[in-house]
């Protein structure tokens, strides 16, 4: 794949992702009400990082926010800060990225600082990603060891002792956001590799065309039973060389000395 | 103004069946649920279960899974029950009510059909 | 199922005094999701269908006159109606509005002398 292609596409997954993250932040179903093997209530329970949502047989939602900081649980607060993290480095990431990108010209940036912008981007992005992997494992740890143990109020009779009034337990499973946090995570992750392996491709590197610009001529090359040896360049002789994509050719090229191009 | 106009009262045979109607007014009939109650003579509410008009999702009582099915015309605004193999358990007033929108309540009543089974 | 179980079954009272009704359901009908009671009481008056007066255990349908209040959380409500009139004349039942299938008490009966 070329380098622009790897890099333009690596950014596209990116936003892909990045649009992801931000709708899963945003929604309501990080926990929807377990409607399995429990009594069927004609109402629908579903919390979000922001508000908790009820909806009726009618259709009739209503949802509440959460209007207080300090008495929401600290784990709930850190996966709200590990999206907003993801966020915020995300938009960071897109920015950088769209002057790093190959086919946008910008004034007289060379590739060398475009490189840089696209590793820089590259980076953003994947741990953006991670952030919002960890903040979306992190509430679906929470939900999970909730489950168990209002499962476990449920067997253990505290629900109805001797006769007494029984109390339902509403236990709270998966919801949708998770799996759209997942994803998004993943692909914003995903992307940011694109664009770090891509950065490779725009690095000046000096071993990039060495093996096709030969400086030795046939006269050079001694025949030898016990094998041939070439002059390629690689000798202790040859000064460093950089050539860059395109093969643009430096000054010490026009300096090699039987013909411009002499294979052996 | 919200009105349920329900069919008229029947005197059907043991093991017949039965198809009652409720014509809807005054409301957008696709915006509600219809929910049909029971009440025997003398005796308390049973609800027998809903038809969402829009999607056509219904929700019955599982004691009268097999013995009522809802239907509606969204054309004519109508909800239908029909009742089979009908016996003397089943002679009751029946009712259609909307279903409000908040609270899951019932907020607007038919006048009620009057079923009797008698051979 | 849930079982509703109204008491008393019937009361009889003159005009203008105070009444009180109860209702117990056998699970709590308080939605944690909401902190609602999803308790409602019907009037039905005699040859007539039910009528709605009160949704979430304690908010009056429009058009329901305010002596009507229902009250009580978890399994326990009460409906309250401050001064009886003539009219009140009717059996009051509650639903539990939460569980599937939805479920109505037996009725209390209210008779004026």
């Known amino acids: 794949m070329s380098v622009t292609a790897c890099q333009g596409l690596g950014f596209v997954v990116s936003l892909i992702g990045f649009a992801g993250i931000i709708a899963a932040t945003c929604m309501d179903q990080w926990s929807t009400q377990d409607l399995y093997n429990n009594p069927v209530t004609a109402v629908f329970n579903y919390q979000g990082l922001w508000r908790s949502c009820v909806r009726e047989s009618s259709g009739f939602t209503e949802c509440r926010g959460y209007f207080t900081l300090l008495g929401l649980p600290a784990m709930l607060q850190a996966v709200r800060a590990l999206m907003i993290v993801g966020i915020v480095l995300g938009v960071i990431g897109i920015l950088v990225s769209i002057f790093a990108l190959k086919c946008i010209r910008i004034g007289s940036m060379d590739d060398s600082a475009k490189a840089k912008m696209t590793l820089t981007s590259g980076i953003l992005f994947i741990i953006s990603g991670i952030s919002a992997i960890i903040g979306v494992s992190v509430f679906a740890n929470m939900l999970v060891t909730n489950f168990w143990m209002s499962t476990a109020n449920m067997y253990s009779g505290m629900g109805g002792m001797g006769g007494m009034v029984q109390t339902v337990q509403t236990r709270y499973t998966f919801g949708a956001a998770l799996f759209v946090g997942w994803v998004a995570g993943g692909l914003t992750l995903i992307g940011g590799v694109m664009m770090c392996i891509a950065c490779r491709g725009l690095t000046p590197d000096d071993s990039n065309f060495k093996a096709v610009s030969y400086h030795a001529s046939g006269q050079n090359v001694a025949y030898r039973p016990g094998g041939f040896k070439a002059s390629t360049g690689f000798g202790s002789n040859t000064r460093n060389k950089k050539i860059y994509d395109g093969g643009a050719r430096t000054e010490d090229d026009e300096q090699s000395h039987p013909t411009k191009y002499d294979y052996v | 103004e919200v009105r349920l106009q329900q069919s008229g009262p029947e005197l059907v045979k043991p093991g017949a069946s039965v198809k009652m109607s409720c014509k809807a007014s005054g409301y957008t009939f696709t915006d509600y649920n219809m929910h049909w109650v029971k009440q025997s003579h003398g005796k308390s509410l049973e609800w027998i279960g809903y038809?969402?008009?829009?999607?056509?999702?219904?929700r019955y009582n599982q004691k009268f899974t097999g013995k009522a099915t809802l239907t509606v015309n969204k054309s004519s605004s109508t909800a239908y029950m029909e009742l089979r193999s009908l016996t003397s358990e089943d002679s009751a007033v029946y009712y259609c009510?909307?279903?409000?929108?908040?609270?899951?309540?019932?907020?607007?009543w038919g006048q009620g059909t009057s079923v009797t089974v008698s051979s | 199922d849930i079982v509703m179980t109204q008491s008393p079954s019937s009361l009889t009272l003159t005009a203008g005094e105070k009444v009180t009704m109860s209702c117990k359901s056998s699970q709590s009908l308080l939605n944690s999701g909401n902190q609602k009671n999803y308790l409602t009481w019907y009037q039905q008056k005699p040859g007539q269908p039910p009528k709605l007066l009160i949704y979430w255990a304690s908010t009056s349908e429009s058009g329901v006159p305010d002596r009507f209040t229902g009250s009580g959380s978890g399994t326990d409500f009460t409906l309250t109606i401050s001064s009886v009139q003539a009219e009140d004349l009717a059996i009051y039942y509650c639903q539990n509005a939460y569980f599937y299938p939805w479920t109505f008490g037996g009725g209390t009966k209210l008779e004026i002398k």
């Open positions: 038809i969402n008009p829009k999607n056509g999702g219904i």
């Open positions: 009510a909307r279903g409000g929108y908040y609270g899951n309540t019932l907020d607007n």
